[in-house]
Interface confidence: low
């Protein structure tokens, strides 16, 4: 997260760290007791490493009573996701068991109504991604509030030049932005999961390159079918 601040500890009980061989790789969001939603491209970086999900964490390194690392029983990338595009950049991870719920671990309701969030709406994005262009990685969860940007502006030739489909949304990126390591994390508007940070190699913090998020409402049928 660029230009953000440290999050209130455990105030985002849905927040997950998708880890490979014990290292944070991507963000994720608990959407059901045994399921974490993340970004499909995260798996590409996992190679053959052991994928696990950390829940109930604020600090990645410090012991915390609510922290627990879960093995992944099943990884289900969206069937249409491809390495060369950010389309359909969603991944569902089934935990080896149902998460133990409490004040620091709780699924987040996700948006099912397939309607764009009003431009200008302030949404919260959080993650353990880099906090500087130099690549400094935080130990504690960071967050930032970002205004949603209308798709027409986001699709301008000077911005993302038509790459933003109806199944994506954008948020402003003027110094405050999601960045590398935040991919798969939640964009939360009004207490509801609206978007998942896409995992392209986009430049961060440049207002001409808004943050791109996969709209979960566009994938309700797929999410339901996997969780069923």
């Amino acid at each position: 997260i660029l230009g953000g601040r440290e999050a209130e500890a455990h105030a985002r009980p849905y927040m997950a760290s998708v880890q490979v061989n014990g290292e944070h790789l991507c963000g994720g969001v608990l959407v059901a007791e045994q399921w974490v939603l993340s970004a499909a491209h995260c798996l590409e970086d996992a190679a053959d490493g052991k994928v696990q999900v950390l829940l109930g964490a604020h600090s990645l390194s410090q012991p915390e009573p609510s922290k627990r690392l879960y093995d992944v029983l099943r990884a289900v990338p969206h069937p249409d996701s491809r390495p060369d595009t950010i389309d359909h950049d969603l991944l569902l991870l089934q935990l080896s068991e149902k998460a133990t719920l409490g004040p620091a671990v709780r699924p987040l309701p996700w948006q099912r109504v397939d309607r764009d969030v009003e431009p200008g709406t302030l949404c919260d994005v959080a993650g353990w991604g880099i906090v500087s262009h130099a690549g400094r990685r935080p130990d504690r969860l960071q967050h930032v509030l970002l205004p949603v940007l209308d798709r027409a502006t986001c699709n301008r030739r000077t911005h993302h030049d038509g790459a933003i489909t109806q199944r994506m949304m954008c948020a402003e990126s003027n110094r405050r932005d999601s960045c590398k390591g935040d991919s798969g994390g939640p964009l939360v508007c009004g207490g509801v999961l609206e978007g998942v940070v896409t995992s392209g190699s986009r430049v961060c913090g440049n207002r001409k390159k808004p943050g791109i998020y996969t709209r979960v409402a566009s994938y309700a049928a797929w999410i339901d079918s996997v969780l069923a």
Partner: antibody, heavy 122, light 107 residues
Framework: EVQLQQSGPELVKPGASVKISCKAS????????MNWVKQSPEKSLEWIGD????????TYNQNFKAKATLTVDKSSSTAYMHLKSLTSEDSAVYYC???????????????WGQGTLVTVSA | DIVMTQSHKFMSTSVGDRVSITCKAS??????VAWYQQKPGQSPKLLIF???TRHTGVPDRFTGSGSGTDYTLTISSVQAEDLALYYC?????????FGGGTKLEIK
Amino acid sequence: EVQLQQSGPELVKPGASVKISCKASGYSFTAYYMNWVKQSPEKSLEWIGDINPSTGGTTYNQNFKAKATLTVDKSSSTAYMHLKSLTSEDSAVYYCATTYYSGNSYVGFAYWGQGTLVTVSA
Amino acid sequence: DIVMTQSHKFMSTSVGDRVSITCKASQDVSTAVAWYQQKPGQSPKLLIFWASTRHTGVPDRFTGSGSGTDYTLTISSVQAEDLALYYCQQHYSTPWTFGGGTKLEIK
């Protein structure tokens, strides 16, 4: 204005089942968990369980796992609780109530239905 | 399960008095405590969460305090309309559990 409208009182015989409804309006139905709470003179308020209207995922109080089944119909923004194998101990007022989030942490039940009285009697 | 105990089933007070209703948790619940008011014939109403945060529209004569296992709801100047049942509830871990309730009676 948030409103939770519950179905009317039920008089049922021991061993029978009952299905209570709770119609939500005034907010995005899928945005908040729907909880069910039992109120009886003997045991005060007891949380039965909750359902995530987005996914249909449920969490039950173990004491009610064999008694209650929670479902939702998203198209009508209605939550349901099915109670089976009723006995006199199940006679109570049953409430639906939405979760309340502060900073995205669950912190209680903000909005309640008016309650449905279930009386189990031969 | 976490047990929430309200030791006083009834409390008697006069209009204008200050009254404190207590609640004890069977384990440390880290201020994850809510308070509800239930008037006769009505549904419960959320007053306080996180032990001390007033819910929207709740008069400031209602204050919550406490930490660890011990929590208190205080009404600084009791009004006639405060005649009701008051319940504490832990929102620390599932299953969410309530106290047995304290009935506030006006002398």
